[in-house]
């Protein structure tokens, strides 16, 4: 269980405003059981971008189908990027808990920078 790693292979990604950004994340194990969440920023003020367990996030789609058993690709695509989306994005694995899931391991982060839309 302790061997699970959350891998974000891209240290940085640069996207033109109005385009989509793909942020890659894979887990190296299915254990422990629990969801993946994506955040922008770290610490108590971080912003939830995507939660595998709950909710619908209209601008975010997963690159692979997370409903399929044994999936370990948690990459996301964020649509219609604006300068306000710039920041460092973290893919975070949670371990199933009761009553609340517990943060287990975070990826190293991917810095998203936004270029001006080509004129």
């Amino acid at each position: 269980e302790e061997g699970l790693q959350v891998i974000q292979p891209d240290k940085s990604v640069s996207v033109a405003a109005g385009e989509s950004a793909i942020l890659h994340c894979t887990a190296t194990s299915l254990i422990p059981v629990g969801p993946i969440q994506w955040f922008r920023g770290a610490g108590p003020g971080r912003e939830l971008i995507y939660n595998q367990k709950e909710g619908h996030f209209p601008r975010v789609t997963t690159v692979s189908d997370l409903t399929k058993r044994n999936n370990m690709d948690f990459s996301i695509r964020i649509g219609n990027i604006t300068p306000a989306d710039a920041g460092t994005y973290y893919c975070v694995k949670f371990r199933k808990g009761s009553p609340d899931d517990v943060e287990f391991k975070s990826g190293a982060g991917t810095e998203l920078s936004v270029r001006a839309k080509p004129s």
Epitope: P35, E54, G55, H56, T67, S98
Partner: antibody, heavy 120, light 107 residues
């Protein structure tokens, strides 16, 4: 064994209220999103409302928005549907169902349903 | 809302026959299409999830395919217990929507 048992249905006059319950057993209720789906007599299935595992995300069909409220009590393993201002077109069998994890997942277990009849 | 259109609405077939039901979506639902079977007076039962994945305990004669806007449920060799109504359902975006159903009857 997973079980979902609906209750609270019955005959009610238009404009009145009714509260449906769905008692869950055989699984960790707090891990699952829950859904209400209805089926009018002789008709197809219509999604009514859904609630995420921690109640953070709630969605309603346009046909019931502002009149129905979905809620859950994880300590009691129970899902609820409060139905106000009932109309004749709300007459249907109401099913509760569970959905593992996020919005994209299917409804893998269903209750047997409870009948709601709205009639004067 | 995403509209789902099933074809045909009803179908008569014989035991042992191969049957195909289609479901078209008004916009892409990626692979988030699921299929349910419902018998009279009973709750729906999940057969196929995410277009092509067989739910645990469902016989292998059931299969699903498709992505985007066009999906298919196939029963390779009809058995007496398969006569029922079949629904597709999308979970790509709210509101969840169902197809109108396909009633499969014995010829």
């Amino acid at each position: 064994e997973v079980q979902l048992v609906e209750s609270g249905g019955g005959v009610v006059q238009p404009g009145r209220s009714l509260r449906l319950s769905c008692a869950a057993s055989g699984f960790t209720f707090s891990d699952y999103g829950m859904i209400w789906v209805r089926q009018a007599p002789g008709k197809g299935l219509e999604w009514v409302a859904s609630i995420s595992s921690s109640s953070s995300y709630i969605y309603y069909a346009d046909s019931v928005k502002g009149r129905f409220t979905i809620s859950r009590d994880n300590s009691k393993n129970t899902l609820y549907l409060q139905m106000n201002s009932l109309r004749a077109e709300d007459t249907a069998v109401y099913y509760c169902a569970r959905r593992y994890y996020g919005f994209n997942y299917p409804f893998d277990y269903w209750g047997q349903g409870t009948m709601v009849t709205v009639s004067s | 809302a995403i509209q789902l259109t099933q074809s045909p609405s009803s179908l008569s077939a014989s035991v042992g026959q191969r049957v195909t039901i289609t479901c078209g979506a008004s916009k892409s639902v990626r692979t988030y299409m699921h299929w349910y079977q419902q018998k009279p007076g009973k709750a729906p039962k999940l057969l196929i999830y995410s277009a092509s994945n067989l739910e645990a305990g469902v016989p292998s004669r059931f299969s699903g395919s498709g992505s985007g806007t066009d999906f298919t449920l196939t029963i390779s060799s009809l058995q007496p217990e398969d006569f029922a109504t079949y629904y597709c359902q999308q979970s790509n975006e709210p509101p969840y929507t169902f197809g109108q159903g396909t009633k499969l009857e014995i010829k």
